[in-house]
């Protein structure tokens, strides 16, 4: 769902952990659209709390009303709380905005568990720690919800950054980023650096800590090391990509690559976990268990339910394997791989940890809606959503959590034939995109 597994996500501190930082390689990528180099005003503009989403501060209406808005590349509506709710400290008050326009239309968004509904309108929107512009954008004013807002999460709305095809109630409702690009000179590109803490944060620390950066209109080179590798956006709805191979500690899962993308593979900042299709998940867990077989963990741990706790500072990262996903490259028969560490896929849980313990949840889970590259993946990398060139870039994040032995990696090129065959073609029916639920 949008919650539970689909939202909950973790935040953290910025900056390379343990003072480790990889040397920059020469940039080999061809010129990117938009401003390049430094976006100082946008760096560190995201915050978040473990498992509960990364959010950016936005203002809505005239005079401006400040709200924290969850950054979600897995949906396409800009929707904000617009009525009192026990979990909201504040909400959008349309009656106080002189620039609010009612579209006299409702919107209802059901998830597998939970839902939100509201009224559509438009208003002036800006991002204080973003580009210095104000745009008129569609806003869904959430008047009723169930299991959508999260107690203590500190965000009051959601910014869907995907494409119009998956907007509700239909694709005629222009998403925020489309409006931003249309109404300004901002290039059609944004990038995300999500910085996982790597250790549990208490509420005070989490609220005060930096969670990362959303760079609107370009790429900030201070946020990554090495070079950017790009994979094509297969279709502009979700940010859909194609995975061509999966390895656990260098061991190929040896599955038909169509299985990896059944029924799609997407990059989704609004999902906590790396979610894998059932068959792939089972094979991956079997391989991860085999790689860490000196230890045995409870069944519930592998289901993402039970927590495993180690005495503070003694987590045996070395017994857990790295996970590599090979993505279709920009050149025919060429792929590249992104590799994450257990520091990304074992998610620290702050609620139960004491000063004596570090507790973790296994953040790889099963999906019935395809592969979802959620925070577990994104926290290892600086991810560029290059909409103008219909591609997504990955580079090693300057803030990813690692140790002295291993680091997340983006490497290539690799020769991979028949990659087009790895994409799954969803049978087109009226209901094919109806299930918003991401449980």
């Amino acid at each position: 769902t949008h919650l539970g597994i689909r939202l909950p996500l973790r935040s953290g501190l910025a900056g390379p952990p343990l003072g480790l930082r990889l040397p920059r390689e020469t940039d080999e990528e061809s010129e990117e659209p938009g401003r390049r180099g430094s976006f100082v005003e946008m760096v560190d503009n995201l915050r978040g709390k473990s498992g509960q989403g990364y959010y950016v501060e936005m203002t809505v209406g005239s005079p401006p009303q400040t709200l924290n808005i969850l950054v979600d590349t897995g949906s396409s509506n800009f929707a904000v709380g617009a009525a009192p709710h026990p979990f909201l400290h504040r909400y959008y008050q349309r009656q106080l905005s002189s620039t609010y326009r009612d579209l006299r239309k409702g919107v209802y968004v059901p998830y597998t568990q939970g839902k939100w509904e509201g009224e559509l309108g438009t208003d002036l929107v800006s991002i204080p720690h973003g580009p210095n512009v104000t745009v008129r954008a569609n806003i869904a004013a959430i008047t009723e919800s169930d299991k959508f807002f999260i107690n203590g999460s500190n965000w009051e709305g959601i910014l869907g950054l995907a494409y119009a095809e998956i907007a509700r109630p239909d694709d005629s409702l222009e998403p925020f980023f489309d409006s931003l690009v249309k109404q300004t000179h901002i290039p059609n590109i944004f990038s995300l650096q999500l910085c996982g803490a790597g250790f549990p944060l208490n509420q005070t620390e989490a609220l005060a800590s930096v969670g990362g950066s959303m760079i609107i209109g370009g790429i900030d080179h201070s946020l990554y090391t090495g070079r950017l590798w790009y994979t094509p956006i297969r279709r502009e709805w979700y940010y859909e990509v194609i995975i061509v191979r999966v390895e656990i500690n260098g061991q190929d899962l040896k599955m038909d690559c169509k299985e990896y993308n059944y029924d799609k593979s997407i990059v989704d900042s609004g999902t906590t976990n790396l979610r894998l299709p059932k068959k792939v998940f089972e094979a991956a867990v079997k391989s991860i268990k085999a790689a860490s077989s000196t230890e045995k963990f409870p069944d519930g741990f592998w289901l993402g339910e039970q927590l495993v706790c180690w005495q503070a500072g003694t987590t045996p990262w070395n017994i857990f394997p790295v996970i590599s996903l090979y993505l279709m490259g920009e050149v025919t028969n060429q792929s590249f791989r992104i590799t994450i560490l257990p520091q990304q896929y074992l998610r620290p849980v702050e609620d139960v940890a004491t000063s004596q313990d570090d507790c973790y949840k296994f953040a790889v889970s099963q999906s019935s809606t395809g592969t979802v590259m959620g925070a577990v993946i994104m926290e290892g990398f600086y991810v560029v959503f290059d909409r103008a060139r219909k591609r997504i870039g990955f580079a090693v994040s300057a803030c990813h959590v690692h140790d002295e032995f291993r680091t997340a990696a983006v490497e290539g090129p690799f020769v991979t034939a028949d990659m087009e065959d790895c994409g799954y073609n969803i049978p087109q029916t009226d209901e094919s995109t109806l299930m918003t639920g991401r449980a």
Partner: antibody, heavy 120, light 108 residues
Amino acid sequence: QLQLQESGPGLVKPSETLSLTCTVSGGSISSSSYYWGWIRQPPGKGLEWIGMIYYSGSTWYNPSLKSRVTISVDTSKNQFSLKLSSVTAADTAVYYCARVGHGISYFDLWGRGTLVTVSS
Amino acid sequence: EIVLTQSPATLSLSPGERATLSCRASQSVSSYLAWYQQKPGQAPRLLIYDASKRATGIPARFSGSGSGTDFTLTISSLEPEDFAVYYCQQVYTWPPRTFGGGTKVEIK
């Protein structure tokens, strides 16, 4: 059917090391489905988890006892053992060995227990 | 650290009566909770695991319910052999080291 039996001295002097062995009969200690654990119960009090071991030798200990506890396994003898060093009167208890099953979470089979008294 | 609080400390009932024992966790443990029975001079015995599943050989009069923070062990009709001490244990955090303080069910 599988049974567990604790053995070892019933009296240990303060500052010495308490040593107990649990013998598993009717099944293999090398099963990949179980951990093997030690729990103790001071007279008239509740249960305290001491630690557990996997047949591979991987161990988990109660942090409050970790500096004094060693649990080991001997698969050839189908036994696992507990050593608790520098004992005091507070370590006087009935010591139980148990199997950790049901998804490697619950103590689904217990030995009868053995009372160890720490006294000079 | 998750703390398990059992209540009441002692429950005085007669054979044939219904016993309701409570175990409250200081924070959610999902359904990862067990109940054990310990008779005088004996080792504990697993009764219920995963909050509501009866262990092998446990009579149907024993049932467990609850999830999150509040759990209940119910003995529908007390038999003479049911008078004992009952402990709950959470394994939401693993290794499985947290037990409740126990509830003694005694004959009235």
